[in-house]
Structures are given as structure tokens and as C-alpha cells.
Amino acid sequence: VSITKCNSDMNGYCLHGQCIYLVDMSQNYCRCEVGYTGVRCEHFYL
């Protein structure tokens, strides 16, 4: 799978994580920090 950094317009897309652009899948993906989940890493769990 080809990946690259997200475009600058997606700054802030991932609330608590790193935004990765999955080129072949035509979508952005959030790699969440430890303790966070959700499509955009918006949910905190213990």
C-alpha cells in the first residue's frame, strides 16, 4: 500500500494522532496516539 503524509488541508483532521494518506485507497487514515480511538482519534479510553 502506497502511503504519504496528508495534504495541508487535513491539518487538524486527526484530533489525537497522525494523519496518513493511503494513496491506493484514496483516503486519509488517522494513526491514533495511545489511549485514543475512533476514525479521527476523537475518543479517549482508559
Epitope: 504519504t4 495534504n7 495541508s8 488541508d9 487538524g12 494513496v23 484514496s26 476514525v39
Partner: antibody, heavy 116, light 106 residues
Framework: QDQLVQSGAEVKKPGASVKVSCKAS????????IQWVRQAPGQGLEWMGR????????KYRERFEGRVTITADTSTNTAYMELSSLRSEDTAVYYC?????????WGQGTLVTVSS | DIQMTQSPSSLSASVGDRVTITCKAS??????IAWYQQKPGQAPRLLIQ???TLQPGVPSRFSGSGSGTDYTFTISSLQPEDIATYYC????????FGGGTKVEIK
């Protein structure tokens, strides 16, 4: 099946406002950005602005600032684009477009006609 | 706002010809360019994103290349069904469409 279903065609008088809705199904708009694009008859595509429904943040093309308002109601999974002070040049098909989780998934378009 | 200058605005070519459309950005867009095909009365159809990545179901005669500010879209062998208007879109910093290229058959 993911869908963006837009409201029906509108006819407005110059100076009036129009509010176009874009209802999402099959996905949560909070996971995406919703963009708005328009196309006047026989003309090219023009990006108007976008909203991040999760945060409520909006960005607008400079020439529409102050005349366009993009909002989202996450409880109904619907985005809206309101354009005020309409003039004949605003006659166009208006599209909502999902981006973020999937690159550019388009609604069917809404024709807005501005005529006296 | 980033400006996208698309050329030519229209072209006429024969079936089987190689067709090339260019888009120049007013600043580096880091390969974040997409190409759309639009036929009359239809919504735009995404052909290519991230400069050269073909969407599923799009024929391999369509291709894209470029980097920095200069990008190219190519139809290697024009077919009658390719008659349409083509648009580039930069999506690095917000969004800007090129002015479009109307492709006709000679």
C-alpha cells in the same frame, strides 16, 4: 451504500437567500469534511468552501466570504450551504462533496435558479 | 488561494490520437492533484488522484504525471466515449479547480 442526497431545485429572486441541504447515509459526517462546489450553466467547477462537522470549523473561498455560510447538524447527519444576496450569476448546480475518509464522493447536485 | 492554470481550454483530436492537458499551480501542491471527466448533464467523475493514481474501473489509457507546480494528464489513444470536459483539481491547500478542457473529436 454510502449516499449524499441533496435537496430539490430552487427558484429564487435576486437579493434573496437559498439554503441547500445535503443528507448523508451509510457514513457519519463527523468522520469527514463536507465540501461545496458549484457549476454555472456552461461554466467550469468552482469550489466554495467546506466544513469539518466534528469541530464545526469552516473555510470559504475568499470571494464568497460574508455571503456563504456552511453548517452541519451531526444529529441528523446533514450539511447545509446557505448563500445570501443572490444575483443572476449565482444560477448554478450546487454539489456537496465528501472528503477525508474517501476521496471526493459527490451528491447529485441541486439546481438553484435566480430570476426576477 | 492557489491558482490553477489549465491549458488548452479546448482541443480537437482524431480517434486514436494522444491527448495531453496541462495544469500549472501558482505554488508547489506536493502532487495533490486530481483529474475529473465531466459529460453534459452529469456530475464530474474522478479519474485520477494524487497525480497518477487511477481510480478503480478507469481505463488504463488515462494517466497523470508531474510534481511541484507542473502536472500533465494524458489520454494515450482517444476514444469516442472520451468526449467530455476535463478538470484538474488541487487539494493540497483547500481546493481550486482548473478552468477545464473541452475535448472534441475531429
Amino acid at each position: 451504500q454510502d449516499q449524499l442526497v441533496q435537496s430539490g431545485a430552487e427558484v429564487k429572486k435576486p437579493g434573496a437567500s437559498v439554503k441547500v441541504s445535503c443528507k448523508a447515509s451509510g457514513f457519519n459526517i463527523k468522520d469527514t469534511y463536507i465540501q461545496w462546489v458549484r457549476q454555472a450553466p456552461g461554466q467550469g467547477l468552482e469550489w466554495m468552501g467546506r466544513i469539518d462537522p466534528l469541530r464545526g470549523n469552516t473555510k470559504y473561498r475568499e470571494r464568497f466570504e460574508g455571503r456563504v455560510t456552511i453548517t452541519a447538524d451531526t444529529s441528523t447527519n446533514t450539511a447545509y450551504m446557505e448563500l445570501s444576496s443572490l444575483r443572476s450569476e449565482d444560477t448554478a448546480v450546487y454539489y456537496c462533496v465528501r472528503s477525508g475518509t474517501l476521496f471526493d464522493f459527490w451528491g447529485q447536485g441541486t439546481l438553484v435558479t435566480v430570476s426576477s | 488561494d492557489i491558482q490553477m492554470t489549465q491549458s488548452p481550454s479546448s482541443l480537437s483530436a482524431s480517434v486514436g490520437d494522444r491527448v495531453t492537458i496541462t495544469c500549472k499551480a501558482s505554488q508547489d501542491i506536493h502532487k495533490y492533484i486530481a483529474w475529473y471527466q465531466q459529460k453534459p448533464g452529469q456530475a464530474p467523475r474522478l479519474l485520477i488522484q494524487y497525480t497518477s493514481t487511477l481510480q478503480p474501473g478507469v481505463p488504463s489509457r488515462f494517466s497523470g504525471s508531474g510534481s511541484g507546480t507542473d502536472y500533465t494528464f494524458t489520454i494515450s489513444s482517444l476514444q469516442p466515449e472520451d468526449i467530455a470536459t476535463y478538470y484538474c483539481l488541487q487539494y493540497d491547500n483547500l481546493r481550486t479547480f482548473g478552468g477545464g478542457t473541452k475535448v472534441e473529436i475531429k
